[in-house]
């Protein structure tokens, strides 16, 4: 682990209460294929614990979405990647709207330092699919 | 190559008999930009020769499509990445919808095992662009 | 940096004038979360300074835009990532339509090599987002 | 096996109205699109629109006001409608199942044809 | 609307010879890797059977002596040996864009 290959890759656990945006993930082999080798989870949010480069990677599906479903909704629903903590580097890092889409998907590279945690808030009121190959959250150190 | 650094980015050869939902690839210099550094192609599918946690990602887009192209079709046209054998380790890793779309792009961190053979399923009846800017299949070891 | 790690990720600072369909990059730690370590802009585009294997990863958002924003308009939006200089070496590297959608985010591994530069191609007449985590682009060599 | 087989009248009236059924057989509508051509000794062979499995059309622009294709997936059943014929438009009139890409746009299977004359 | 223009307009062959007939499109029928042009025989009296699908390959049940050719705006259909049940019009059809459109065909006589 000295070598700093920080790396992480989460399935959806739950949602939180109504008026918490944030998604709950887990991660571990007696889960299926998620696994946190350097970074943390701190009541289902992801906590760096190495600093460096990292690139953050995620997909959100909704569940039992059709290209209609996304439309219905007179809010849109948005799916937003930031740090969350601490307070001082609060800042939204990658975000995506599902449009008339189901899915969304991206990546970035991005700078984190040890104690930061990162939240991905699905605003909107459309339930995400927690199926592992539908939905998932990863991060990877790739330089100091 | 002793390090571990196993790389390989594929471009679409052809897709699959009609009862075969595969998509088949292939990869090397002379073809372009695809090419082959420690995995190998068995019969057009990706087949792992070391263990570690790996980096896949796919975009495939959909021939001369436009948005109305994929919602003409009563079935829906979904990409699954997987493991197809051995049979022992089958799971699907990654799974993505085109709903109104022509584009599905993403990518995951996941474990892999020597002699694991990813398959790239496209249901649906649309034929995938050929074009090796639009559809694409890659994988890249980053630990073990 | 001698290991090689080059690694670059970008904000969009504007677009090109009318017959110019390239985004223009800005990087470095005083814009935001952006930076360049190894890679280096030239007239707002992305110059590579090592040979290797690169991860090319990319998301742009429209700006203002609904699902019918991208509808409305005959000619489709499209975004090209390419090699543009030296000529010889050019070509067109990962594309993407918009479509009914309003983001687009992709990932490929390409050979690069030392004095390539990449454009990115936003053709259609619908102005990109620069809000930094609706609109980036980054490279990161993965092996040589 | 697959099978496309078309029922409707030989003989129209100017001004009047075409209808034909397309009643198929060996796979489901709701899989395939149908297509319909005619062909003339004028014009040969012209494609006229298009019902695809989730029940969305596509016309022939210089036909689309004149042009109707509706269908009953559970009846397997084609229904094609042309109003306001005249004479030019005496022609064999097919229908043809799209091949199984859905975005390749060829006729893998066809039906016998139904020969259309306009006449008074 | 692409104009299909074919070539000849008939020929007559001989039993085991080669039998060539080209379609030539007034824009680009290839897109996303693939070559949008299909090839239809036609018998009097019965329906147009699809021959082949972009441009070369082959519809199943189809004989091996049917092939087809080319990429962009020009097209090729070669049959050989030709065959007596080979008599027929044989029509080129694209499908890059809406409206599809055919050729004017080709008539294959036996000499």
């Known amino acids: 682990e000295s070598l700093g290959w920080d790396i992480a890759e989460l399935q959806l656990n739950h949602t939180g209460p109504q008026q918490d945006p944030r998604l709950y993930w887990q991660g571990g082999p007696a889960l299926g294929r998620s696994f946190l080798r350097g970074p943390e989870l701190d009541k289902g949010q992801l906590r760096i614990r190495r600093d460096g480069i990292y690139m953050v990677h995620i997909q959100v599906t909704l569940a039992i979405c059709s290209s209609t479903s996304t439309s219905r909704h007179h809010h849109p629903t948005t799916l937003a990647v930031g740090i969350c903590s601490p307070a001082s580097r609060s800042i939204s890092l990658l975000r995506l709207s599902f449009h008339q889409g189901c899915t969304i998907a991206s990546q970035r590279l991005t700078p984190l330092a040890r104690g930061d945690t990162l939240c991905t808030n699905l605003t909107g009121t459309l339930l995400p699919s927690r199926n592992t190959d539908e939905t998932f959250f990863g991060v990877q150190w790739v330089r100091p | 190559e002793s390090l571990g650094w196993d790389i390989a980015e594929l471009q679409l050869n052809h897709t699959g008999p009609q009862q075969d939902p595969r998509l088949y690839w292939q990869g090397g210099p002379a073809l372009g930009r695809s090419f082959l550094r420690g995995p190998e192609l068995d019969k057009g599918q990706l087949r792992i020769r070391r263990d570690g946690i790996y980096m896949v990602h796919i975009q495939v887009t959909l021939a001369i499509c436009s948005s109305t192209s994929t919602s003409r079709h009563h079935h829906p046209t979904t990409l699954a990445v997987g493991i197809c054998s051995p049979a022992s380790r089958s799971i699907s890793l990654l799974r993505l919808s085109f709903h109104q779309g022509c584009t599905i792009a993403s990518q995951r961190l996941t474990p892999l095992a020597r002699g694991d053979t990813l398959c790239t399923n496209l249901t649906g009846t649309l034929l995938p662009s050929r074009n090796t800017d639009e559809t694409f299949f890659g994988v890249q070891w980053v630990r073990p | 940096e001698s290991l090689g790690w080059d690694i670059a990720e970008l904000q969009l600072n504007h677009t090109g004038p009318q017959q110019d369909p390239r985004l223009y990059w800005q990087g470095g730690p005083a814009l935001g979360r952006s930076f360049l370590r190894g890679p280096e802009l030239d007239k707002g585009q992305l110059r590579i300074r090592r040979d290797g294997i690169y991860m090319v990863h990319i998301q742009v958002t429209l700006a203002i835009c609904s699902s019918t924003s991208t509808s409305r308009h005959h000619h489709p939006t499209t975004l090209a990532v390419g090699i543009c200089s030296p000529a010889s070496r050019s070509i067109s590297l990962l594309r993407l339509s918009f479509h009914q959608g309003c983001t687009i985010a992709s990932q490929r591994l390409t050979p690069l090599a030392r004095g390539d530069t990449l454009c990115t191609n936003l053709t259609g007449t619908l102005l990109p987002s620069r809000n930094t985590d609706e609109t980036f682009f980054g490279v990161q060599w993965v092996r040589p | 096996q697959v099978q496309l087989k078309q029922s409707g009248p030989g003989l129209v009236q100017p001004s009047q109205s075409l209808s034909i059924t397309c009643t198929v057989s060996g796979f489901s509508l709701t899989s395939y699109g149908i297509h319909w051509v005619r062909q003339s000794p004028g014009k040969g062979l012209e494609w006229l629109g298009v019902?695809?499995?989730?029940?969305?059309?596509d016309f022939n622009a210089a036909f689309i006001s004149r042009l109707s294709i509706s269908k009953d997936n559970s009846k397997s059943q084609v229904f094609f409608k042309v109003i306001s014929l005249q004479a030019n438009d005496t022609a064999i009139y097919y229908c043809?199942?799209?091949?199984?890409?859905?975005?390749?746009?060829?006729?893998?299977?066809w039906g016998q044809g139904t020969s259309v004359t306009v006449s008074s | 609307d692409i104009v299909l223009t074919q070539s000849p307009t008939s020929l007559a062959v001989s039993l085991g010879q080669r039998a060539t007939i080209s379609c030539r499109a007034s824009?680009?029928?290839?897109?996303?890797?693939?070559?949008?042009m299909h090839w239809y025989q036609q018998k009097p009296g019965q329906p147009p059977k699809l021959l082949i699908y972009l441009a070369s390959n082959l519809e199943s049940g189809v004989p091996a002596r049917f092939s087809g050719s080319g990429s962009g705006t020009d097209f090729t259909l070669n049959i050989h040996p030709v065959e007596e049940e080979d008599a027929a019009t044989y029509y080129c059809q694209h499908s890059r864009e809406l409206p599809l459109t055919f050729g004017a065909g080709t008539k294959l006589e036996l000499k």
């Open positions: 043809g199942r799209n091949s199984y890409y859905g975005n390749l746009y060829a006729m893998d299977y």
């Open positions: 824009k680009s029928v290839s897109a996303s890797g693939y070559s949008f």
């Open positions: 019902i695809w499995s989730g029940g969305s059309t």
